[in-house]
């Protein structure tokens, strides 16, 4: 349970996280399991420990083996094991199964491919993306943050996608590549009467006077592309733009998201410097499409600033 497989290619950077988490964690010590020899923390070493992370900069085939991490705190010491395998670089284009990360599925309208393990590294955009070893070019492909977006996905887009990025450590650059398979699902679209997921009908939202508050109006309208769909906020039955209170604004740009394959929209109402009079207003979340309109009403109530029993860091 507390062991994790990690792999990488020789001469590339590999960063591994300890599979045990501290609750809390004060220090983390790393050891070579076979020899019980401590792994240094000095960054001048090619292999060194940095808290929860074990860094191979760069990795060598001889680094393969099991590494022990001990998460120390006053109450308990927790032990985890990282099973690391470093492979030689392939001369041909084929990426063997043992170098593949989990397969992801996409559809015509949802085609994000995340670059595996990238959150462990100190990298800067943009990522380079390859499909079956060919650099991706053309307007259909967009490298966005840590993922690739493919517009108008077709069944031919299925295949093995490799992301390549540079990890920077103290001014030195190291290359990292990671590959995963992408499969394409056929998706039939449909439209239905709007379903508001948030807020709940007649919800009371607790706010602090003088603080900022956000209300999210979130609704789903069916599956696939929606011809007409919108979510918006009204104040006392009036559009936000017509209400004329500059402290209260709708967040621009309704992004169509696909949770569980559904086409959904979000609209955030931002209230700056909440005032007493804001508690008297009626806030309506409206969702509409060709089937009709649904409305959920929210009211604000004052919250005592630190009257919490479950504050956590």
């Amino acid at each position: 349970k507390f062991s994790k497989q990690s792999w990488g290619l020789e001469n590339e950077a590999l960063i591994v996280r300890c599979p045990r988490q501290g609750k809390p964690s004060y220090t983390v010590d790393w050891y070579y399991s076979q020899t019980n020899k401590s792994i240094p923390t000095q960054e001048r070493n090619r292999v060194f420990a940095s808290g929860q992370l074990l860094k191979f900069l760069p990795a060598a085939v001889a680094d393969s083996g099991i590494y022990t991490c001990i998460v120390r705190s006053p109450t308990f010491n927790r032990t985890g094991y990282a099973n690391v395998t470093i492979y030689k670089k392939q001369s041909d284009c084929n990426v063997p199964d043992y170098l593949m990360y989990s397969t992801v599925s996409g559809s015509e309208k949802n085609s994000k491919i995340y670059c595996p393990t990238i959150d462990l590294y100190n990298w800067t955009a943009p990522l380079e993306w390859f499909k079956n070893c060919q650099a991706l070019q053309g307007s259909r492909y967009r490298a966005h943050k840590s993922f690739l977006v493919i517009d108008n996905v077709m069944t031919e887009d299925a295949g093995d996608y490799t992301c390549k990025f540079i990890h920077n450590e103290n001014g030195a650059n190291y290359s990292v590549t990671a590959t995963r398979s992408f499969t394409v699902k056929d998706e039939q679209g449909f439209s239905l009467f709007p379903v508001i997921g948030a807020p709940a009908q007649n919800e009371i939202k607790e706010v602090e006077i003088g603080k900022n508050a956000n209300l999210t109006c979130s609704a789903c309208f069916g599956k696939g592309t929606q011809f007409l769909a919108a979510v918006l906020w009204q104040l006392n039955g009036t559009k936000i733009t017509d209400f004329g209170e500059p402290r209260i604004q709708q967040e621009e740009g309704q992004n169509q998201s696909f949770s569980n394959g559904l086409a959904c929209l979000d609209m955030v109402l931002r209230i700056a410097d909440v005032k007493e009079e804001d508690l008297l207003l009626q806030y309506d979340c409206l969702a509409l499409n060709l089937h009709g309109l649904r409305r959920h009403t929210v009211r604000l109530s004052r919250k005592n600033p630190i009257d919490h029993h479950s504050i956590y860091c």
Epitope: Q21, K23, P24, P74, T75, F76, S310, I311, Y312, C313
Partner: antibody, heavy 118, light 112 residues
Framework: QVQLQQSGAELVRPGASVTLSCKAS????????IHWVKQTLVHGLEWIGA????????AYNQKFKGKATLTADKSSSTAYMELSSLTSEGSAVYYC???????????WGQGTTLTVSS | DIVMTQAAFSNPVTLGTSASISCRSS???????????LYWYLQKPGQSPQLLIY???NLASGVPDRFSSSGSGTDFTLRISRVEAEDVGVYYC?????????FGSGTKLEIK
């Protein structure tokens, strides 16, 4: 909202034992340590011990070793503290408390009042 | 055991003014990792304690920024910049550096 729901007040006779419970909701029970704290007017807040629900490992304050026994049931997300051979010194409010990555006593139960009296 | 020392009462403060509460530890709470393991809690009348500050100077989630904390390895101060009526209660400092974890005896915030 993370909640730790503790069992109700107890009145027990000297020499008896009692088991207090602490049920966690809205967070992963095994992702936290559960700590127990005693509060009296005389001694204030005193740390009794902690349990790691994931492994069942325990740590105790030497003062309460042999007096308190901590256990946890992962299936019901509940931690228990058994207090044995009780005397009037055991009369107190007992709190369970959950930890996070940065804090040991990040959130607290509502407390259980224990009265030891004949 | 590390002893945490607090005064039983604060100087009475007027609402809207600032208040300071002190705490002293019998041993430095500075860990080799560079973190000072000093925590502040507030216990309002009839309620459980609630976390205010962790690792000496970090504000816990949901706590107003009127609260701040500073100190060395052994001497610590909790400051409330504009005291409000709901801030009344007993303020405890605690150390999480080593077992057994220990708490101060608490300082009651008094309003004039």
């Amino acid at each position: 909202q993370v909640q730790l729901q503790q069992s109700g007040a107890e009145l027990v006779r000297p020499g008896a034992s009692v088991t207090l419970s602490c049920k966690a909701s809205d967070y992963i029970f095994t992702d936290s340590e559960i700590h127990w704290v005693k509060q009296t007017l005389v001694h204030g807040l005193e740390w009794i011990g902690a349990i790691d629900p994931e492994t069942g490992d325990t740590a105790y304050n030497q003062k309460f070793k042999g007096k308190a026994t901590l256990t946890a049931d992962k299936s019901s997300s509940t931690a228990y503290m058994e207090l044995s051979s009780l005397t009037s010194e055991g009369s107190a409010v007992y709190y369970c408390s959950g930890s996070t990555t940065d804090c040991y006593f990040a959130y607290w139960g509502q407390g259980t009042t224990l009265t030891v009296s004949s | 055991d590390i002893v945490m020392t607090q005064a039983a009462f604060s100087n009475p403060v007027t609402l809207g003014t600032s208040a300071s509460i002190s705490c002293r530890s019998s041993k430095s709470l500075l860990h080799s990792n560079g973190i000072i393991y000093l925590y502040w809690y507030l216990q309002k009348p009839g309620q459980s304690p609630q976390l205010l500050i962790y690792q000496m100077s970090n504000l816990a989630s949901g706590v107003p920024d009127r609260f701040s904390s500073s100190g060395s390895g052994t001497d610590f101060t909790l400051r409330i910049s504009r005291v409000e009526a709901e801030d009344v209660g007993v303020y405890y400092c605690a150390q999480n550096l080593e077992l057994p974890f220990t708490f101060g005896s608490g300082t009651k915030l008094e309003i004039k």
